[in-house]
Amino acid sequence: EPPGPEQRVVRRAAEVPGPEPSQQEQVAFGSGDTVELSCHPPGGAPTGPTVWAKDGTGLVASHRILVGPQRLQVLNASHEDAGVYSCQHRLTRRVLCHFSVRVTDAPSSGDDEDGEDVAEDTGAPYWTRPERMDKKLLAVPAANTVRFRCPAAGNPTPSISWLKNGKEFRGEHRIGGIKLRHQQWSLVMESVVPSDRGNYTCVVENKFGSIRQTYTLDVLERSPHRPILQAGLPANQTAILGSDVEFHCKVYSDAQPHIQWLKHVEVNGSKVGPDGTPYVTVLKTAGANTTDKELEVLSLHNVTFEDAGEYTCLAGNSIGFSHHSAWLVVLPAEEELMETDEAGSVYAG
């Protein structure tokens, strides 16, 4: 059921900073608030199927907990709802967003720093969309566009000015400049970069008073990391002699990855060299016309018993290497099995 009109909906959004979020977002809600956590993709990237968890345990939807693919709502929050919430990719269990949620006794309030309830007919400034101004933290992937807005009214029409980290903020303070639209009560920054992080305050004032709202901008950079391989891939395979087999390896990497498929072999009866390094033969590596997608699959046709053994997907980039391995078991064809049975021996798979 949707929250009733008397309930505040407090939104907190985090953008996916890549496969391993570097930090938890600390957020606080008031008792009785509707908590809304959202987790959005970077650079126009769909996240795929997701699940939400609290303190490591999967959340199940109920009349009070509404679970969506990129959004979680908890109605009428109480102290028991405090904890660490995470949004994870359903298949890889990769953590996409992390929130540390506190629930305080008092319902959270808007950022009206003068704290006085001034009647609208006095002409003092007031927010025209206060219910939409509670998303105080904006976490945005680098290169995207951000617009802060403080829609207001008053009589006479108030002026608006902007501060960054408490100091006057002007276009020349930023490479690429800013767009100030006084009629829209807005500040626009295109192609944000990490140096745009900070607190942005709109100050709306006329001769009868002043109100202000502070937004926090976090610009998410993907920290460089070695390739990440999807859990569970490649998977162990059992195949019949003469059949075809495919191993799959899913690679995530910001820096361009180099992917190889290796087969573990024995040399003079040993699987490892004197230094402990395994003996391998390279089955597949990047060529002039191979795409990443093609390299993520190793196809074995018409397998023989010699094909049985351990296979490794090795992915490297400028930061480092990652690898996952899987085993192939090759079973004899059914006719051979029957012949062996008649001879009285037992086959253990």
Epitope: R149, D254, K293
Partner: antibody
């Protein structure tokens, strides 16, 4: 200069497949998604689907589900759109476009397309 | 899924004002982007987040969005404004892009 350059015109028979490429330059490829939009002769723009250049995740319009595949190759900063089981109604200009995220403190997040390829004409005829 | 409605055509004399509308249920709760497409060319983004002009787009263009209608306005229309204009929203429920049917602007004379 930021640009998307698409592969050349194609003529295909009904039932065949077509694969259109879109090579990006002038920006960090993995920071923006790629959308595919088509336009039949004399008609409006029709969104087909999009792909994350970061992890390959995709999302397709219901109409094309199962018939279209959008992929990327980060080593060459190239996106691909393959459309299968072509019919005469698929005759159109196919565009790739860079997907940019817009984040608004009041309205939340929205995506738009700020840079477009020049278009690839695909003609399906027996 | 959002449905966006645009009138198919609009004719305006040079120097006058062209007003494009994009209708949709509670479209004012979403952010609208606008594209211009000249004959034989790819679309170009001319307005984003209802009211914001990308670099290189003249100040003659402005936008608004309220209730069930988003509007793109071009003042002092010139012959070079002749094109098709499309509105677009992002349907966050389905992660899908939705376009309006487009309006063809003809500059008279």
């Amino acid at each position: 200069e930021v640009q998307l350059v698409q592969s050349g015109a194609e003529v295909k028979k009904p039932g065949a497949s077509v694969k259109v490429s879109c090579k990006a330059s002038g920006y960090m490829f993995t920071s923006y998604g790629i959308s595919w939009v088509r336009q039949a002769p004399g008609q409006g723009l029709e969104w087909m689907g999009w792909v994350s250049t970061y992890n390959g995740d995709t999302n397709y319009a219901q109409k094309f589900q199962g018939r279209v595949t959008v992929t990327t190759d980060t080593s060459t900063s190239t996106a691909y759109m393959e459309l299968r089981s072509l019919r005469s109604e698929d005759t159109a200009v196919y565009y790739c476009a860079r997907v940019l995220g817009y984040y608004d403190s009041i309205d939340g997040y929205y995506y738009g397309m700020d840079v477009w390829g020049q278009g690839t004409t695909v003609t399906v005829s027996s | 899924q959002s449905v966006l409605t645009q009138p198919p055509s609009l004719s305006v004399a040079p120097g006058k004002t062209a007003t494009f509308t994009c209708g949709g249920n509670n479209i004012g709760d979403k952010s609208v982007h606008w594209y211009r497409q000249k004959p034989g060319q790819a679309p170009v983004l001319v307005m984003y987040l209802d009211t914001e002009r990308p670099s290189g787009i003249p100040e003659r263009m402005s936008g608004s969005n309220f209730g069930n209608t988003a509007t793109l306005t071009i003042t002092r229309v010139e012959a070079e404004d002749e094109a098709d204009y499309y509105c677009q929203v992002w349907d966050s429920g389905s992660d899908h892009v939705v376009f309006g049917g487009g309006t063809k602007l003809t500059v008279l004379g």
